[in-house]
Amino acid sequence: GCINITSSASQEGTRLNLICTVWHKKEEAEGFVVFLCKDRSGDCSPETSLKQLRLKRDPGIDGVGEISSQLMFTISQVTPLHSGTYQCCARSQKSGIRLQGHFFSILFTETGNYTVTGLKQRQHLEFSHNEGTLS
């Protein structure tokens, strides 16, 4: 199976959404757990994660094309405590498959703004609490 994981982020007002997306075929979903870790360079696991999502095969989806499943972790107001290195991961003990996304970081600046780095270039985001916009 060709399964991969990507990381992205989006802003809604003061809220920051960290999104882990797993691309897979319908029949590959069962047995997978997707999870998001913070500051876990070597031992990112569902047990040490901020949030986890168990994938289920959706009988309502027809065809064998690639589909995506998303885990979303929402930070209602980014603070210095949220600074750190994050990683999206997925794993299936049933199949012995482990997917580890690229590390990305949240950096809270002294001016009260924060940046998210390490995502794909088009997903390299800079946020300002004051203006509530992407910059």
């Epitope: 060709c2 049933k94 199949s95 482990r98 580890q100």
Partner: antibody, heavy 112, light 107 residues
Framework: QVNLQESGPGLVQPSETLSLTCTVS????????INWFRQPPGKGLEWMGT???????DYNSALKSRLSISRDTSKSQVFLKMNSLQTEDTAIYFC??????WGQGASVTVSS | DIQMTQSPASLSASLGETVSIECLAS??????LAWYQQKPGKSPQLLIY???SLQDGVPSRFSGSGSGTQYSLKINSLQSEDVATYFC?????????FGSGTKLELK
């Protein structure tokens, strides 16, 4: 069709090193991980360790100091090496694709 | 390590009967439990994973249930080919651990 086949010596001397090979077909080791399990005669199952699809490994802490799992993806083979064998290591050793497809097992006796 | 206590150790049942095997984990394993069937001289076969998901190709007379620390395997309408030893396994925490097995025989 998914197939796994364990191979290695049937008899190992105490204090020697056990080397087993798991040869797989019907899938790629870069897409699936392999677990090693063992089962002493007439007893239950013990998980030994995992080599993931990305080549990373996890080991049973009780065996970690003398166990090593590696692979050669081009030959579709996974290798188990365990040193300082004792009679209590006598068992049938299984490799499995994750949890869902198992080899038939390789019988290993530790005896002088 | 998580201890898996499986009961009964052995079980005798008649064809067509429904049988249940229990597995108790020493701590919450969050449904990360598998059931295997092993026939004499053969390797284990995965029946159930994630406590209640039926592995492809396994007859629907097998079912799994439970949560937290208590899990069970049920076999409806027992068939002669179901004579085997059954093991539970937790895969929530390293090291993965197994129950001691239940030997199922025909009356």
């Amino acid at each position: 069709q998914v197939n796994l086949q364990e191979s290695g010596p049937g008899l190992v001397q105490p204090s020697e090193t056990l080397s087993l090979t798991c040869t797989v077909s019907g899938f790629s080791l870069t897409n699936y991980g392999i677990n090693w399990f063992r089962q002493p005669p007439g007893k239950g199952l013990e998980w030994m360790g995992t080599i993931w699809n990305d080549g990373g490994t996890d080991y049973n802490s009780a065996l970690k100091s003398r166990l090593s799992i590696s692979r050669d993806t081009s030959k579709s083979q996974v290798f188990l090496k365990m040193n300082s064998l004792q009679t209590e290591d006598t068992a049938i050793y299984f490799c499995a694709r994750g949890m869902d497809a198992w080899g038939q097992g390789a019988s290993v006796t530790v005896s002088s | 390590d998580i201890q898996m206590t499986q009961s009964p150790a052995s079980l005798s049942a008649s064809l067509g009967e429904t049988v249940s095997i229990e597995c108790l984990a020493s701590e919450d394993i969050y449904n990360n439990l598998a059931w295997y069937q092993q026939k004499p001289g053969k390797s284990p076969q995965l029946l159930i994973y994630y406590a209640n998901s039926l592995q492809d190709g396994v007859p629907s007379r097998f079912s799994g249930s439970g949560s937290g620390t208590q899990y069970s395997l049920k076999i409806n309408s027992l068939q002669s080919e179901d004579v085997a030893t059954y093991f539970c396994q937790q895969y929530n925490n390293y090291p993965f651990t197994f129950g001691s097995g239940t030997k199922l025989e025909l009356k």
